[in-house]
Interface confidence: low
Amino acid sequence: KPSNEATGNVSHSGMKKEFLHELKAENIKKFLYNFTRTPHLAGTQNNFELAKQIHDQWKEFGLDLVELSHYDVLLSYPNKTHPNYISIINEDGNEIFKTSLSEQPPPGYENISDVVPPYSAFSPQGTPEGDLVYVNYARTEDFFKLEREMKISCSGKIVIARYGKVFRGNMVKNAQLAGAKGMILYSDPADYFVPAVKSYPDGWNLPGGGVQRGNVLNLNGAGDPLTPGYPANEHAYRHELTNAVGLPSIPVHPIGYDDAQKLLEHMGGPAPPDSSWKGGLKVPYNVGPGFAGNFSTQKVKMHIHSYTKVTRIYNVIGTLKGALEPDRYVILGGHRDAWVFGGIDPQSGAAVVHEIVRSFGTLKKKGRRPRRTILFASWDAEEFGLLGSTEWAEEHSRLLQERGVAYINADSSIEGNYTLRVDCTPLMYSLVYNLTKELQSPDEGFEGKSLYDSWKEKSPSPEFIGMPRISKLGSGNDFEVFFQRLGIASGRARYTKNWKTNKVSSYPLYHSVYETYELVVKFYDPTFKYHLTVAQVRGAMVFELANSIVLPFDCQSYAVALKKYADTIYNISMKHPQEMKAYMISFDSLFSAVNNFTDVASKFNQRLQELDKSNPILLRIMNDQLMYLERAFIDPLGLPGRPFYRHIIYAPSSHNKYAGESFPGIYDALFDISSKVNASKAWNEVKRQISIATFTVQAAAETLREVA
């Protein structure tokens, strides 16, 4: 049967109902169980076996084509015979304390081998020894506070920082810039232990021996450190390790709060600068350097023996060919590799993707194909720097930039069970608002109400009254290459915690051995109703993007966002009124471009309302204008010092990879500008960045004009 035909025997809305109805909580639960029986560390046999299993099941589900896509990338592992640890040594060099070599296995998992001990992936080897300095979250502002206000130097010191607030790679980068020779990362109870909740296995809190694994790279979107910009295939030229992108230069190691207590309890030096530096341990949180009083002769020593290795990784790529527009790709992707069991990250997401694939496959078996092609991806090595997704996108960049309609990310489905959390391009705001109005809320107290209703009540927008919050895309997940490098409209959705009452960073057991199937079933989502809701949201996004006659993108939402971002960056700049005047810095051109974009977007929407949708050429023209609008914000030259972050409106914050920054070029040029030695040069760069932003917004507006 020709595949470029139609979309099934029911209407768009009927077909969507059927698709959504096919999604079952019980299946997601079953898939999660299946995906969490063993560890699935990237580059290991277990993860290859899971890739093959998913490949086979996606074929059974009815996808047209499923392939394994492999790359040989730089990964990092601890040395099995030479474990990593940190010790306190006395003046004679004897170890008087050693941190744990591993986490205690959770009940029922005592006999499982292959549990990788806690480590910081890509840490170099080394045995630095010295005084400790406590640097809070190791944010840029924390180091400013230490160095500028407290006059404490980290040069030649080992720094200890608590996880939370920012991406750990940024923490390490900041420590390196401050001159540290080693870094210890730990989980503080203030950030990873919610009061009145028990520790695992009796609750969902982090026990004292629990440790967060994670990579400490600063790739800035490069992908495999040895093949930046190009796929790590057999033909690839590989840099020498000394020229690899983003590797840390100092040894780094993570520990739990029981071990941190021992390292911090005798810290000397000044008290923390303010209470925001105090965590939840019974220690003074003195900054150091070094220990106090009788302990002043003791030092801290790191013992890091991890190694890097070029290792084969495997993505699973499934294709469901579009009936009418097979050359337009809607991508749903999430990673498969886990630090250990991956009960939440990533398998709560992978299980949802699996069920979405099954539902689309069921429709296809009934002859109901999507209008556009849907690509499904099970990415490998996300935990090692988004490597699987980035290498695949690098390999297929020419196709993706020409044909990519949208990318929907599908990592962890839950990080809590309070309300929905969405980050996406403004193009998708309307899509998300509309589809959540059609879904039932799973929340207690919202029976019979829509997901939109519970979401807006629990997470209201700070700008728009009566609407739910949607956040900017940052990074730290597999949408990065699609959005920040290629300019493909992207979005993500998951269920989250109550950020107002629950101050923990992420969820307490994140990247620990205790992130198990039982954690989810016992404490987060016993009935899997939240997983089902996330499946419905992600699935409906993909469904609409793949089946709507007119792409469900709203360029006017982008106009509103651009105005807000221009106001924000202008207000930041206006904190320096004298310099603005002296160096003749004006935002008039940017505001003019934004106004023009707003006008053009409005006219475009008017034409869209009047579009003769029965004319396939006219329809394709306007759909292409919508599809390519995100692409229009890409600058081929990239952002300063970050060539793979090419989106001019959004980039991961230079200070926190997880967070999105608007007008990042201007923001970075303005950041800490008052401390720059050469003010004239600094303000000239602000001027240059304003001109780039102005040109980009103006150029993007031009793409929305009537074609002739």
């Epitope: 139609a6 025997n9 029911v10 209407s11 768009h12 002859g367 006659i549 949708k613 029965s614 396939p616």
Partner: antibody, heavy 123, light 108 residues
């Protein structure tokens, strides 16, 4: 009530293009949410679905006719058209314009039929 | 394509009798099946959709049953105006939507 009325030439020469129009009265394309299609009937082949359209412009074609078939809709005139190129004697049939049961039931059963128009392909 | 086969090709019964018309699909079409009645010189008319749901205005003597591949249209008590050709049509798997070849119902 809703009515469908087919119109077009009763006689078409081989290799030429058959154009038929269906005028819909009593219902608006754009607000009704129905799917509209064409079916033909010959004594030899019985009833044969040709294709279907939605007001938004979605078109659904019988693969056997796909290369020769174009369906269009003019919402302002409340009519939809069939164009079948390179006709042969095998295209001689009674052509019905139809409405699928609905609204929003998609390509379901056909609940409304025009009275049909006989098309003969002959030189 | 899903091939729909109807039997018998012709059915001849006296008024008041029960008529049973069969339709078989070459593969499962679930309950996505419709029945039509076409009287001489007229367009077809929808009788049943969803295998068993009567369309608006259709007399209760017409009933449909079956699912998967085997379907039946039953006319409980034949009347003279039921003289017609009856077609089944599947709308589960497409394109194309396909019809059966028809059963001609004659009144003795």
């Amino acid at each position: 009530q809703v009515q469908l009325q087919e119109s077009g030439p009763g006689l078409v020469k081989p290799s030429e293009t058959l154009s038929l129009t269906c005028t819909v009265s009593g219902a608006s394309f754009s607000s009704s949410g129905y799917y509209w299609g064409w079916i033909r009937q010959t004594p030899g082949r019985g009833l044969e679905w040709i294709g279907t359209m939605f007001y938004s412009g979605a078109t659904y074609y019988n693969p056997s006719l796909r290369s020769r078939l174009t369906l269009n809709m003019d919402t302002s005139k409340q009519e939809f058209t069939l164009r079948l190129t390179s006709v042969t004697a095998a295209d001689s049939a009674v052509y019905y314009c139809v409405r699928h049961r609905g609204p929003d039931s998609g390509l379901d059963a056909f609940d409304l039929w025009g009275q049909g128009t006989q098309v003969t392909v002959s030189s | 394509d899903v091939v729909m086969t109807q039997s018998p090709a012709t059915l001849s019964l006296p008024p008041g009798e029960r008529a049973t018309l069969s339709c078989r699909a070459s593969q499962s079409v679930s309950s996505y099946l419709a029945w039509y009645q076409q009287k001489p010189g007229q367009a077809p008319r929808l009788l049943i959709y969803g295998a068993s749901t009567r369309a608006t205005g259709i007399p209760a003597r017409f009933s449909g049953s079956g699912s998967g591949t085997e379907f039946t249209l039953t006319i409980s008590s034949l009347q003279s105006e039921d003289l017609a050709v009856y077609y089944c049509q599947q709308y589960n798997d497409w394109p194309p939507l396909t019809f059966g070849g028809g059963t001609k119902l004659e009144i003795k």
